[in-house]
Amino acid sequence: AGVFELQIHSFGPGPGPGAPRSPCSARLPCRLFFRVCLKPGLSEEAAESPCALGAALSARGPVYTEQPGAPAPDLPLPDGLLQVPFRDAWPGTFSFIIETWREELGDQIGGPAWSLLARVAGRRRLAAGGPWARDIQRAGAWELRFSYRARCEPPAVGTACTRLCRPRSAPSRCGPGLRPCAPLEDECEAPLVCRAGCSPEHGFCEQPGECRCLEGWTGPLCTVPVSTSSCLSPRGPSSATTGCLVPGPGPCDGNPCANGGSCSETPRSFECTCPRGFYGLRCEVSGVTCADGPCFNGGLCVGGADPDSAYICHCPPGFQGSNCEKRVDRCSLQPCRNGGLCLDLGHALRCRCRAGFAGPRCEHDLDDCAGRACANGGTCVEGGGAHRCSCALGFGGRDCRERADPCAARPCAHGGRCYAHFSGLVCACAPGYMGARCEFPVHPDGASALPAAPPGLRPGDPQRYL
């Protein structure tokens, strides 16, 4: 168990032309908050897939009001870290999504209006207990700077938070068979806690909560002696016909050794003989070092002087992956701005620009807003090969002549009907619901038993009982 921590350093306009318009205005102050979603492994799942490692929301930042005429600065941020607790082992490789949300502090009925300003995503390798890793991600014209780390919650330690440590019982040394816990010299690796009642003489465990029996003993707690006098074979007597008890499968059955290791039985358990490059009880840990030349395609290997410390491959341009084994599709980084077509010619990238744009990356907008008018207080923005209007709140369309629909964001819960009103919106609740936005079911369960889902529950409004 442990905690993933994310510290947002800044959120503001990225470098280059086309600075984004401030998300807040004098008429409509707003504040930011952030959401982080974590998934194990290097998954390339859709943003909507579950945050299997966990998710967190920040507090809201200070209220910000744009100074008229001033460029959008870095926006004021919420205090504190975003913390995502994880219950199980830290996976080492993970995918993240960080969303920047804007909360408009206008006169919305039933609560604040929220909109997603930017979403960044990435895939990273990270060992628990390591230093803060710094990152910069761009989403459109916005830039997010942040740091992150994973740390174990005591008594867990290690790069995956799977080893347990306890304070030493004796001042000088750890108990029999228990190693000191680096980097906590005053602590010892804790003995595994076997299943409650597991025989201390005839049972043992390799993972918390299990009870494995020594030869000659059986039963869920290893308290039943195996009688072999009238059995058909030393390993597998028939309990139905002879009254013999069948011991569990042999410790090497199913070969518990990973990565091509070979298994041999020992009096207490089993032993894996690991192939070169792997070690650990089940050969599950890669012992590859820089001496083994793990970096392909001319990658530079750093660190990893001994099998317990990880190596890192610094890849040459055009390659990626933990071992520089993947050729980068450089066009997947979308280097051509403003809808330009990307061509990877091997030795170089070329951008074929759309009409109205020029430059090596189509970054120069040849258009301008001269003589273009945006209605209802909208402002003209260059881009896209034609002028575009950034409209004031409540208006939309190409020239800001259309009234925006305040009901478009489904602001009424539990199937409530939304009605646009001169001051914002009004929710007419479905029978059985009340509240400014219909968020409170009057009778949430149809019977006195729990947990029954309220009537009319829809996939959009799932129920969580704690």
């Epitope: 929301l57 409170f440 949430p444 799932p462």
Partner: nanobody, 117 residues
Amino acid sequence: EVQLVESGGGLVQPGGSLTLSCAASRSSVSFLSMAWYRQAPGKKRELVAGISTDGSTDYIDSVKGRFTISRDNAKNSVYLQMNSLRAEDTAVYYCYAYRWLTRYTYWGQGTLVTVSS
């Protein structure tokens, strides 16, 4: 996932007062519409009072003027101040949260309020 923990229940005489607290973790209560429900033995669970994200409040008729729901963003908690308690207010009181960002609803485990002389 939002977690809700209620406290403050207990035995009180008719006409007495109690304040229930609901502490939320893993989400700021300012993002949540919060409510108190109650379930008397053998009866359906019913809404008692609710507070939306904008601070507007709702009460069922039988508690209007006696109960007050409030929220403290700094303590990440919601409260139900119950005055002039009656025997018919005896029930298990549950904290409820509606999270707008995900449109999930969450429940606490409940705290028992007994009004008896």
